[in-house]
Interface confidence: low
Amino acid sequence: ASGTEAATATPSKVWGSSAGRIELRGGGRGALPTSMGQQGPSAQARAGRVVGPRSAQGASPGLRVHKTLKFVVVGVLLQVVPGSAATIKVHDQSVGTQQWEHSPLGELCPPGSHRSEHSGACNQCTEGVGYTSASNNLFSCLPCTACKSDEEERSACTRTRNTACQCKPGTFRNDDSAEMCRKCSTGCPRGKVKVKDCTPWSDIECVHNESGNGHN
């Protein structure tokens, strides 16, 4: 057995996520390092990974989730300090949440869960409230994004995936307008012809008349 020295900190009702970065690489993750979209199993699939003796039971740029996540991960994981004004309050997960056995030299908590700062156990995220898309040791789930007024929800927030928001029809967001949806152009300038309709992530595309023929 290993020896354990645990600091005796007073439990706080507000949880900070400076506990560390979300692990985006292995463990339900592909080769190191990978992007946000990890290839690992679902939280449900990994929920059975309770360690014990043998006797025991044996992406598209128009989706705001991509850009938002980059900032959420950096902001939440590196800047938030427990007890600071920026801390995240974890929603009460005492009812109906599943816990996995934790060991001091254990694995990361699976996607869809987070590390309990008090017990060290993995607590499941609350569906529609928080998520973790990769194995992690965060002290709280990342909060689900609420789509802005100029956006629509492409897919709802699950325990393992953030809300995917996209611009409403007739508007778009590209790399130049990451924070707001812009109205699509109504038509092409004189001498140009439309070859591509507006999408939530790009404006209409126009080409010079002579090269555009036959592309409609």
Epitope: A9, G26, R29, A31, G52, S103, P104, L105, E107
Partner: antibody
Framework: EVQLVESGGGLVKPGGSLRLSCAAS????????MHWVRQAPGKGLEWVAG????????YYADSVKGRFTISRDNAKNSLYLQMNSLRAEDTAVYYC??????????????WGQGTLVTVSS | QPVLHQPPAMSSALGTTIRLTCTLR?????????VYWYQQRPGHPPRFLLR?????????GPQVPPRFSGSKDVARNRGYLSISELQPEDEAMYYC???????????FGSGTQLTVLS
């Protein structure tokens, strides 16, 4: 580039003390768990101690419990191993290793070159 | 009896494929463990190679080529490290480790010395 550089090794008499240091660079030290692993001459790897990202949780192998103390100074990007009541069997190359997570796992993704500790009279 | 058992030595010819074994003591179930593999060349520190839990849940170490791959045999309670297209630089000691248990007395296996025959 991730770098871990151990120092503080040397020759010490049985019962003596030594403090090993590990200087970390090339990553955000304060967000990773860290370990000390040793290797006696011609032998295999033996995990010695581990500490989580904040220093709040420390873990030791039975063989060193009560004699060794692991600590870290995140402001200085440094990991330490205070070794007291040293024995001949503590003679080994001591490696500093980074855990891939904030807590402690068996996934030690980067290792230092090691520092040799010799306990002999 | 150690928690993890590795054969002390194995050898194979240049360019061939070899499979190293790490057997978990039978009072534990490898089905719930990840298997970790480390390589240590003479005079060098250990290097993390890979972690294997299942085909869909695995990770490769930094700059570790796909010639190195992991697998498990739950029925035999074993983890494997396969090395294909053996090269001279693969001659090294290979250690396995498994997670996660609260007991950390035996984190690493005893190691297998791999010899590459030319």
């Amino acid at each position: 580039e991730v770098q871990l550089v151990e120092s503080g090794g040397g020759l010490v008499k049985p019962g003596g003390s030594l403090r090993l240091s590990c200087a970390a660079s090339g990553f955000t030290f304060s967000t990773y768990g860290m370990h000390w692993v040793r290797q006696a001459p011609g032998k295999g790897l033996e995990w010695v101690a581990g500490i989580n990202y904040s220093g709040n949780n420390k873990y030791y192998a039975d063989s060193v419990k009560g004699r060794f103390t692991i600590s870290r100074d995140n402001a200085k990007n440094s990991l330490y191993l205070q070794m007291n009541s040293l024995r001949a069997e503590d003679t080994a190359v001591y490696y500093c290793a980074r855990d891939h997570s904030t807590w402690l796992s068996r996934h030690l993704d980067y290792w230092g070159q090691g520092t040799l500790v010799t306990v002999s009279s | 009896q150690p928690v993890l058992h590795q054969p002390p030595a194995m050898s194979s010819a240049l360019g061939t494929t070899i499979r190293l074994t790490c057997t978990l003591r039978n009072d534990h179930d490898i089905g719930v463990y990840s298997v970790y593999w480390y390589q240590q060349r003479p005079g060098h520190p250990p290097r993390f190679l890979l972690r294997y839990f299942s085909q869909s849940d695995k990770s490769q170490g930094p700059q570790v080529p796909p010639r190195f791959s992991g697998s498990k045999d739950v029925a035999r309670n074993r983890g494997y490290l396969s090395i294909s297209e053996l090269q001279p630089e693969d001659e090294a000691m290979y250690y396995c480790a498994m997670g996660a248990r609260s007991s950390v007395t035996h984190v690493f296996g005893s190691g297998t010395q791999l010899t590459v025959l030319s």
